[in-house]
Interface confidence: low
């Protein structure tokens, strides 16, 4: 016996957030892993007084304590519908079924005399049917339904007389069923029997307040278990060759402060006072944990030396329950002021350390849903995924000897103090129906798949590829709005006077009269800010730099009456100096952010994008920029993420759609202007960039979620892409969905009707497709009332806690970008695509491993899209160059321009043009690499500042 559980709270220093196996492990369980599912008799059998069954303490408790529930009479009616339970088991494909025998169904008054024939027949039929199906029964003798007669006559488990009566009952079960049962559980979760049955009064028999009674009950339960184990070991094991244990339940707990020894001590006490209370005598040294003996000496019974010897080792494996009953409501004593946690992996590690690495059967695990949830129990899938992932990690990474897993529960049923207000079944049962059909929930489909695959196969992503992007691929970095410096920061050479420094006197500079020096014209390098930009860009080794102009700075009045020439000169410098380094610019004309619309003040006050005239003002601004910078800039983005302006114009759906309409018109007017007036001489390309996260159904077994995922893409991307890339009008699916909600009185939104002239104006006004892609969203359908864009979509998002995520909860799901690229091509044809922003926030200020991981994985998927799917991907712009103070850390550089290690990683990918085979040449011909920049530099020299 080792007893070293407290070591679990000393955190593993090797934990790395980007080793995804430490978050979610794609692997299989051991070959002979034991997959099962469980029920409790009282919860599902129903027929509480049918065919001679006696009342249990719970039948009585329900009538006396749970006023709004009259009985478990109906429940799922497993006693009547045995065949339906067997069909459900067949559907899932389990290796074992864990169920409990109702003591009062066999012996109505608890005393072992002649068994109730109908009860005996029921369990015998069930066992025969399981054996026939090759499903191993795991049978629990006592899952809380003590015969009422024993409670009334003896005071239940408070009286040690029950120990022998329980042993008689167990003996009978071994005799009658032992030929077909190889796994026995004596008692299910004795902690709850004692604590809630006699302490809080929340469970039958509903006694409360007497701490001595609580620990007496616990004592008798342990002794009863031990007696039965010895009985089985001596009289039945030799010929039945089975195993026997007791299911012990627990919560898990984390210290408030992971370094604080007092908090860690409290966590240990918390686990010991719940799990250790029963585990220590049985799996440990045969006695109660030392901490309990000291603290509870006045109420905790004492084991004699002989009893300790008798208790010790009375379990053939560690049966562990980890579910809501141990978490809600968790008494304050057990919490010890620390943080309750659902980390099953850590709980298993604690058991390993505390009880010398026993073989473990997870005898109950699962969570619950609200009773209104029927078959689409999406959150249950994610809870199961999380728990199973933790079990797999415990087996594969921590070498914990878990040999089986019991999903809880097979059926919806009576859930103790929660009665019928929650559901825990993998099969839905309508308790008010007569036939009590078992309808598989999403979680049943999911568990079935897990069992079939014996774990988690990595189906989502294909293996990494080796290969390279083309020589003309744009390797970029994106920056948001560059605020122009109003005056060159360095006045050097612009002042013609000579000065002498009075170093010994007043330490001032004195002008030397009569001397005039030669000055020189202003230079781009006079702007300190530009120097910083160029230094960062040079270190990035990118070929392209995407940044945004500040419309409000260039045209403070919103029209051409007052042009800020200094701002234009600043931007021209950024572009021209970049070109000298071989870095071309992709310039964004308008980059609104949530906090600041970035519009010139007069336009903002004239209702901004709700006013159609803003589109005309934008056209004039775009024309100015094309004219002033277009000789140097060959890639233009008119508007960044217009589909995200719904975050700002969100007073109503009609505001959102109206603003979006004006943004589309603004873009189209700018594109038409470029096409007509500037393209012939400048030969550039113009588009707008859309926020384009991918969407997956949160619940892949629910049709409504698949439809919601497609609807998300329609409302998010097609909303702008369809009018520009394809038809000149909004997506039919989006229009129809909003209209149908309108008809049903669920929304007063309506998409604007476009005139034929507007359709002609919009259609085809893109030279390439520009997408900002960051993550994949898991979406579910939820009918929402209200007249806002967000509610018009009828979509809710789900955060998958098993996924690697950033501090702002962006999930790292690389394969989403490949799916997005294929979807765009399928819907809008084979066009040039640029990923104009893609990145993740990472807390690290130096070694930003999450960003490196993200870049490597996402670029792999983009490469697959290029090599395998033949998508015309032309460029990837990592987001973003430098982080901003007190904003999520997306930058390759800190806000004070310190470089992070992801820069070298990106450098390497750029210099290799992807992920080449060993020894393959990554060089492109010199002419290909430099043609564009030679032309650019020639232009730079010809154009005056």
């Amino acid at each position: 016996f080792s007893g070293d559980g407290r070591a679990i709270w000393s955190k593993n220093p090797n934990f790395t957030p980007v080793n995804e196996s430490q978050l979610f492990l794609y692997d299989t369980f051991p070959k002979n892993f034991f997959w099962g599912i469980g029920t409790g008799a009282l919860q599902v059998e129903g027929s509480w007084k049918k065919d001679g069954k006696g009342p249990s303490i719970w039948d009585h408790f329900i009538h006396t304590h749970l006023k709004n529930v009259s009985s478990t009479n109906g429940s799922s009616d497993s006693y009547i519908f045995l065949e339906k339970d067997l069909s459900a088991l067949d559907f899932i494909g389990v290796s074992f079924y864990q169920f409990s025998i109702s003591w009062p169904r066999l012996f109505p008054d608890g005393i072992v005399t002649v068994a109730n024939a109908k009860g005996l027949q029921y369990y015998s039929t069930l066992l025969d049917a399981l054996v026939l199906r090759n499903i191993e029964p795991i049978v629990t003798l006592y899952h809380w339904d003590l015969p009422l007669a024993l409670q009334e006559k003896y005071g239940g488990w408070k009286n040690d007389t029950i120990i022998d009566i329980f042993n008689d009952y167990a003996t009978y079960c071994f005799q009658m069923f032992g030929d077909r049962v190889k796994y026995w559980i004596t008692i299910h979760n004795p902690y709850l029997v004692a604590w809630h049955g006699y302490g809080t009064g929340m469970h039958a028999p509903g006694e409360k307040g007497n701490l001595a009674a609580v620990y007496t009950v616990g004592h008798n339960l342990i002794k009863a278990h031990s007696k039965v184990w010895h009985n089985y070991n001596t009289h039945f094991r030799p010929h039945q060759k089975g195993w026997l244990s007791i299911t012990l339940g627990s919560h898990w707990i984390e210290p408030n402060r992971s370094e604080n020894t007092m908090d860690i001590f409290k966590c240990q006490q918390s686990m010991v006072s719940v799990l250790g209370w029963f585990a220590n005598p049985i799996h440990g040294d045969g006695d109660y944990p030392e901490g309990m003996r000291k603290k509870l000496f006045s109420v905790l019974p004492i084991f004699s030396e002989a009893e300790k010897h008798e208790m010790r080792g009375t379990a053939d494996f560690f049966a562990f329950s980890f579910g809501p009953n141990n978490f809600k409501p968790l008494n304050t004593m057990a919490k010890m002021g620390q943080n309750v946690s659902l980390n099953l992996r850590e709980a298993l590690n604690w058991i390993k350390l505390e009880y010398n690495n026993p073989r473990i059967l997870i005898a109950e695990n699962g969570w619950f849903t609200d009773s209104r949830v029927k078959t689409e129990d999406t959150t249950a899938i994610y809870m199961m995924k999380n728990f199973l992932s933790q079990v797999l990690q415990a087996i594969r990474l921590d070498e914990i000897r878990v040999f089986g897993y019991t999903a809880w529960s097979l059926l919806d049923g009576f859930e103790w103090q929660d009665a019928y207000t929650i559901r825990r079944g993998l099969f839905y049962v309508d308790f008010n129906s007569k036939q009590k059909e078992r309808k598989p929930k999403s979680s049943a489909h999911y568990y079935k798949q897990i069992i079939r695959e014996n774990g988690f196969s990595l189906k989502e992503s294909t293996p990494d590829v080796q290969g390279q992007f083309p020589c003309d691929f744009s390797w970029g970095v994106t920056e948001s709005v560059l605020k122009p410096e109003s005056v060159a920061s360095s006045p050097q050479f612009s002042d013609p006077h000579l000065y002498v420094w009075n170093a010994t006197g007043n330490r001032l500079l004195h002008r030397v009269e009569g001397v005039r020096l030669k000055t020189r014209p202003a230079q781009c390098t006079d702007f300190v800010n530009i120097k910083k930009q160029l230094e960062m860009l040079a270190r990035m080794k990118v070929t392209h730099y995407r940044f945004a102009l500040d419309w409000a700075s260039v045209l403070p009045t919103g029209n051409l009456s007052a042009v800020n020439r200094q701002a234009l000169r600043y931007y021209r410098c950024v572009v021209s100096e970049g070109l000298k380094l071989g870095i071309s610019a992709m310039v964004t004309l308008y980059y609104p952010t949530h906090a600041h619309l970035g519009l010139p003040e007069p336009l903002l006050h004239a209702d901004g994008w709700l006013n159609p005239s803003t589109a005309e003002a934008f056209q004039a601004y775009a024309g100015l920029c094309f004219q002033e910078l277009g000789d140097l800039v060959k890639l233009w983005i008119t508007i960044n993420e217009p589909n995200r302006l719904s975050d700002i114009y969100n007073r109503s759906g009609n505001d959102t759609y109206g603003a979006a309409h004006n943004l589309l018109v603004a873009h189209a007017l700018a594109w038409r202007l470029y096409d007509r007036q500037f393209r012939p001489s400048q030969r550039g390309a113009v588009s707008l960039s859309l926020h384009a996260d991918w969407a997956e159904p949160a619940n892949p077994y629910a049709d409504s979620h698949w439809r919601a995922a497609e609807r998300f893409l329609q409302f998010e991307i097609a909303w702008f892409a369809e009018p520009l890339f394809k038809t000149g009008d909004y997506p039919a699916a989006m229009r129809e969905y909003i209209a149908s909600k309108h008809r049903r009185g669920l929304s007063s939104s309506a998409l604007p009707r476009l005139t034929e002239a507007e359709r002609r104006l919009l259609k085809g006004t893109v030279d390439f497709c520009a997408l900002n892609h960051f993550t994949t969203r898991f979406v579910m359908h939820e009918q929402l009332a209200g007249s806002r864009y967000d509610s018009d979509r009828d979509i809710q998002f789900l955060q998958d806690i098993t996924r690697l995520s950033s501090p702002t909860r962006l999930a790292v799901i690389p394969w989403g970008v490949r799916k997005l690229l294929r979807w765009v091509r399928r819907n809008y044809g084979d066009m040039d695509i640029y990923i104009t922003a893609s990145g993740i926030d990472d807390q690290a200020l130096e070694d930003d491993r999450l960003r490196k991981y993200y870049l490597g994985k996402y670029l792999q998927e983009v490469l697959k899209a290029y090599l395998i799917d033949k998508v015309r991907i032309k460029g990837y712009y990592a987001f973003k160059l430098a982080e901003e103070k007190s904003k999520p850390r997306f930058g390759f550089f800190t806000s004070d321009f310190k470089a992070k290690s992801s820069i070298q990683f990106y450098n390497k990918v750029i210099s290799s043009r992807g992920f080449p085979f060993e020894n393959s040449s990554s060089r492109c011909s010199q002419t290909q690499e430099n043609t564009e920049c030679t032309v650019c530099l020639f232009l730079v020299q010809k154009k005056p500042l």
């Epitope: 007084k49 009538h63 009259s70 478990t72 109906g74 009576f414 007569k434």
Partner: antibody, heavy 124, light 109 residues
Framework: QVTLKESGPVLVKPTETLTLTCTVS??????????VSWIRQPPGKALEWLAH???????SYSTSLKSRLTISKDTSKSQVVLIMTNMDPVDTATYYC????????????????WGQGTTVTVSS | SYVLTQPPSVSVAPGQTARITCGGN??????VHWYQQKPGQAPVLVVY???DRPSGIPERFSGSNSGNTATLTISRVEAGDEADYYC???????????FGGGTKLTVLG
């Protein structure tokens, strides 16, 4: 406070159809544990159960009268309606609606609240 | 169909105990409910699920159920207890509500 109130015609002619309405208050017909039954009692005779509707809209009818009865509910109006076709003088009775509190299954703990009843006479 | 049989009448002196029976095939496996109906009034539930009393019903009313007979017992009978009493079950197999024929309790004197 839970109440049920029956309403309908006092007099119907033989072969006609009787429509009775039970308006409930103090509980919802959507409540998973509530059902409503119709019961009648001819003058001086015993109670006779006619039909029952569950919260999930399942229905159950007396075997002897099944072909003549239709029970339905309008949750938004908190009403349960019984339609009985082809009325006959032997159908003269006081008609009651009563709430049943359903337990875990479709069994229930009796009819805990009754309406005051409405008397229907069938005569030409 | 399932039939519940009650004696048409039971008489008892005030202060004595009245027992009203309700017979049915294996009625012990059903939940039995009892109603009291006074002239001109709607029935009132007095015992449900064999032996439980709704709030407001005196402790004098109790019930039992086993084998083929369920019994309503009224101890210390009062004049105000005079009424018709009906037993009722929800017969699970046929999925029907069944009432007994009713018993008229007469309080003598």
């Amino acid at each position: 406070q839970v109440t049920l109130k029956e309403s309908g015609p006092v007099l119907v002619k033989p072969t006609e159809t009787l429509t009775l309405t039970c308006t409930v208050s103090g509980f919802s017909l959507n409540n998973a544990r509530m059902g409503v039954s119709w019961i009648r009692q001819p003058p001086g005779k015993a109670l006779e159960w006619l039909a029952h509707i569950f919260s999930n809209d399942e229905k159950s009818y007396s075997t002897s009268l099944k072909s003549r009865l239709t029970i339905s509910k309008d949750t938004s109006k908190s009403q349960v309606v019984l339609i009985m076709t082809n009325m006959d003088p032997v159908d003269t009775a006081t008609y009651y609606c009563a709430r049943s509190v359903v337990t875990g299954g479709y069994y229930y703990d009796g009819m805990d609240v009754w309406g005051q009843g409405t008397t229907v006479t069938v005569s030409s | 169909s399932y039939v519940l049989t009650q004696p048409p009448s039971v008489s008892v002196a005030p202060g004595q105990t009245a027992r009203i029976t309700c017979g049915g095939n294996n009625i012990g496996s059903e939940s039995v409910h009892w109603y009291q109906q006074k002239p001109g009034q709607a029935p009132v539930l007095v015992v449900y699920d064999d032996s439980d009393r709704p709030s407001g019903i005196p402790e004098r009313f109790s019930g039992s159920n086993s084998g083929n007979t369920a019994t309503l017992t009224i101890s210390r009978v009062e004049a105000g207890d005079e009424a018709d009493y009906y037993c009722q079950v929800w017969h699970g197999n046929s999925d029907h509500v069944v009432f007994g024929g009713g018993t008229k309790l007469t309080v003598l004197g």
